[in-house]
């Protein structure tokens, strides 16, 4: 390793927290603007996947569905390779992802649409515990544009527990977004797509390296939160967004001061949705434990605009609409740590359906 330098995997080091959040209650969901993808069949099974190739999904109003527009114009087609092998992928070629990685055609994929009335209240889902997320300005962190998203690489020491004996360490965080006109969250709630979404990716402490955990149940855990517009600027996010111009070019990477990672998440870590899914990009490995917070994080319109226009991706195209279409549940139950269903009773339903990471 480079001498005198330390970090994860022998990594060499390169020489006010909450801005207000909203609950995802049904009342905040537009009734006309965002129609759910499909009406579910009577038997409760999921409809066939509607790919982003075919239409702009929920992010367009019903009147727009007759003239479909796929969220793929920011990225070229899959086949434009510059090297050997067949591993290049784009958001404009999601139908080809299974050719890149067969797991992308798996039955338990992410993201998903969270239908509130179908969630199962699970009393055993306790508030998440985060430890060591309040980073100091030094050491600095790597912020990069990898052509698919903006990524902040996190240092060792950020620990998270999904529950007793389910400990993880944070590896990195990244964002998904749309354009100025179209929202770009990956998960949706009752068919509603939010402007953007943050993912904090964690590795189970049962594994020393990521490749060992890929595809293993509970090997990876992702904390996800929706970003929503508000009048106020989010000072925590500004510490990221203010650097985007410096990494506008695909592949660029800079060092920025450490920040309070917990301030990028909602303040209420007790109300969330939980299901088992996959990575949302190739190789789409399954067994990922997803935690989607009920509270949204607020950013100003200017900040959301900055996120959607600052970065460039493959083939000199804007890095936008970097979200995957919602995937069928295929019988999975989305659990909630609180009574999220509209008709929920005081007593928890499906309490025995609660699963543990790694089950």
């Amino acid at each position: 390793q480079p001498q005198g330098l330390s970090g994860m995997q022998g990594e060499p080091s390169l020489g006010d927290s909450s801005s207000g959040e909203d609950e995802l209650g049904v009342d905040v969901l537009p009734s006309e603007e965002d129609a759910p993808e499909e009406a579910d069949p009577p038997d409760g099974e999921d409809p066939p996947e509607v790919n982003s190739e075919d239409r702009m999904e929920e992010s367009l109003g019903l009147e727009d569905l007759s003239t479909p527009e796929a969220p793929e114009h920011s990225q070229g087609s899959h086949g434009d390779e510059k090297g050997g092998g067949h591993s290049h992928w784009s958001y404009g070629g999601t139908l080809l992802w299974p050719q890149v990685s067969p797991a992308c055609a798996g039955r338990f994929q992410s993201p998903v649409d969270i239908r509130l009335e179908r969630t199962a209240f699970c009393r055993t889902l306790q508030p998440l515990e985060l430890l060591g997320y309040e980073l100091q300005p030094l050491p600095e962190l790597s912020l990069s544009n990898n052509g698919h998203t903006v990524q902040l690489t996190l240092p060792p020491g950020l620990k998270m527990a999904l529950g007793p004996g389910q400990e993880y360490r944070a590896l990195q965080l990244h964002l998904h977004w749309g354009t100025s006109d179209h929202p770009g969250s990956e998960h949706t709630v009752n068919g509603h797509r939010f402007p953007a979404e943050i993912h904090v990716v964690h590795l189970s402490t049962a594994f020393s390296e990521l490749h060992e955990a890929l595809g293993r149940p509970g090997g990876l855990a992702v904390l996800a939160a929706f970003l929503q517009e508000s009048p106020e600027e989010n000072s925590a996010y500004e510490q990221l967004l203010s650097h985007l111009e410096e990494i506008s070019e695909e592949g660029s990477k800079i060092e920025i001061p450490g920040l309070d990672v917990s301030a990028l998440l909602p303040s209420d870590l007790s109300r969330y949705y939980r299901y088992e899914g996959s990575l949302t990009t190739p190789p789409c490995s399954q067994g990922v434990i997803w935690t989607v917070f009920n509270e949204t994080v607020k950013l100003s319109a200017k900040q959301l605009h900055t996120l959607s226009v600052s970065l460039w991706g493959p083939r000199d195209s804007r890095l936008q609409l970097n979200f995957r279409a919602t995937q069928p549940l295929n019988g999975r139950t989305i659990e909630a740590s609180f009574p999220a269903a509209e008709d929920s009773s005081p007593e928890p339903v499906h309490v025995n359906s609660c699963f543990t990471a790694g089950d």
């Epitope: 995997q9 290049h88 990069s144 990898n146 990524q151 690489t153 590795l203 592949g251 990009t281 991706g313």
Partner: nanobody, 117 residues
Amino acid sequence: QVQLVESGGGLVQPGGSLRLSCSASGGARNIFSFAAMHWYRQAPGKGLELVAVITSAGGTYYADSVKGRFTISRDNSKKTLYLQMNSLRAEDTAVYYCNADYYQDYWGQGTQVTVSS
């Protein structure tokens, strides 16, 4: 065991060329194709410097100090990263490290490049 192994370093005269390779073995082979791959270097007594990047989509990025002289490329079928270095200068003398960035960083042990007459 994840391994990134650099090779191709050596002693070369100013103006000369070298081609570095970085081969992935073990678990690194599974993530290579999806990783953004980097070349870094560390000159004696200096900090680590990013030299070049190639994303999983094939996009490339170079430090200003090497633009027009160095070319990064990858062969995903061979799980190998390359750095073609032309018009080498004395200030290019350093240990060169290969890095795979896929959710977490994987590093090679480095290969020494010395540019001297």
